[in-house]
Interface confidence: low
């Protein structure tokens, strides 16, 4: 004869455990039904009656089979620097992620607790390491022969154009300006240039690294936007 299927609540055999989606109630000393995701235990089981489940109220949820007396509260609304990528439902918590141009400086189990703006590299500095969802942009001074004339969280240092005759030499924050004869674009930084009879390499002024390019002592918010030049208040 096949073994008889036990219906909850039932007393488990000594040394055995309750089945999947059941839990052992210490008070009743019985195996009882868990509540499904989106529900919670309204009334716990007894020796003669099974768990009574009820739906989660608005703005609360349970994600797993459970026997909790109250559903969990959904997290607070996403802040203005975040995007809601998963809405609060009876079965799942709200998930907030950082909006474009920001990164997660302090994550939580799902989503982000604290977003910070991606650092922008100022003219004379280019992106050495792009920002990700969880890390800030790292800027570096443009090496000789390269420049960046933008304030950007994505622009890298670009090579100066090579002029037959230089009108204005390039520097870290400005491309070389050639005289009316058409320039030839230089190759990538570090590439070998074939000697040109009339080519004049544009001079390059190395920028002084800003305070924000130094490694930060902060483990939580490693970097932010680059500070303005000392003393320049713009007022």
């Amino acid at each position: 004869l096949p073994a008889q299927v036990a219906f909850t609540p039932y007393a488990p055999e000594p040394g055995s455990t309750c089945r999947l989606r059941e839990y052992y109630d210490q008070t009743a000393q019985m195996c009882c039904s868990k509540c499904s995701p989106g529900q919670h235990a309204k009334v716990f089981c007894t020796k003669t009656s099974d768990t009574v489940c009820d739906s989660c109220e608005d703005s609360t949820y349970t994600q797993l089979w459970n026997w909790v007396p109250e559903c969990l509260s959904c997290g607070s609304r996403c802040s203005s620097d975040q995007v809601e990528t998963q809405a609060c439902t009876r079965e799942q918590n709200r998930i907030c992620t950082c909006r474009p141009g920001w990164y997660c400086a302090l994550s939580k189990q799902e989503g982000c607790r604290l977003c910070a703006p991606l650092r922008k590299c100022r003219p004379g500095f280019g992106v050495a390491r792009p920002g990700t969802e969880t890390s800030d942009v790292v800027c570096k001074p443009c090496a000789p022969g390269t420049f960046s004339n933008t304030t950007s969280s994505t622009d890298i240092c670009r090579p100066h154009q090579i002029c037959n005759v230089v009108a204005i030499p390039g520097n870290a924050s400005m491309d070389a300006v050639c005289t009316s004869t058409s320039p030839t674009r230089s190759m990538a930084p570090g590439a070998v240039h074939l000697p040109q009879p009339v080519s004049t390499r544009s001079q390059h002024t190395q920028p002084t690294p800003e305070p924000s390019t130094a490694p930060s002592t902060s483990f939580l918010l490693p970097m932010g936007p680059s500070p303005p030049a000392e003393g320049s208040t713009g007022d």
């Epitope: 802040s79 203005s80 620097d81 305070p211």
Partner: antibody, heavy 124, light 110 residues
Framework: EVQLVESGGGLIQPGGSLRLSCAAS????????VSWVRQAPGKGLEWIGA???????YYSNWAKSRFTISRDNSKNTLYLQMNSLRAEDTAVYYC??????????????????WGRGTLVTVSS | DIQLTQSPSFLSASVGDRVTITCQVS??????LSWYQQKPGKAPKLLIY???TLASGVPSRFSGSGSGTEFTLTISSLQPEDFATYYC????????????FGGGTKVEIK
Amino acid sequence: EVQLVESGGGLIQPGGSLRLSCAASGFSLSSSAVSWVRQAPGKGLEWIGAIGSGGTSYYSNWAKSRFTISRDNSKNTLYLQMNSLRAEDTAVYYCARDPNSSDYPYGAYGMGLWGRGTLVTVSS
Amino acid sequence: DIQLTQSPSFLSASVGDRVTITCQVSQSISSYLSWYQQKPGKAPKLLIYYASTLASGVPSRFSGSGSGTEFTLTISSLQPEDFATYYCQQGYITSNVGNAFGGGTKVEIK
């Protein structure tokens, strides 16, 4: 001349609403992060919120429900709408901007330009 | 909430004294801290930004240091015009802010 001038303060009854203005001259408000800061008589500075150059508003936790910051770029003016006013909202209200044009939310490099402030008195 | 705690709240000092005010922040803010001076009936004046950069027109006797959560404002030799209230302000955290300013430190004549 680069300056900020607040207006719209005065005596208001508890529960009432008031809109303060902050007119900018000598620079474009739309390219700056500008904050509202208040100071109750004999008390410290209290940050209310700000609007970034990108147009995003930021608020302190206590101000979120009753205060709204907006901007009219055509008038080069910032506004602070205050609702359900209470006696404890009595203060001098200042607008202040970052010392550099930046799309950083507020005060990353301090607030280098301040208005003279406008007094709001909430009393019956 | 992020909290900025200034100490001391009151400070009595004499002209020529070296004065130090500290600002403790409950969360790391990298170097995004500013210091202000305020005199009665006047708007605050920016002294230092980015923790240690002197604002335009501010005397060199004022200096700032620190990063992360601990910051210091130092006045190397107190002058008669320096008797005022000083505030620190964070400009990095944008969500869950109670107040971006510290409680203030009043520097009085001894």
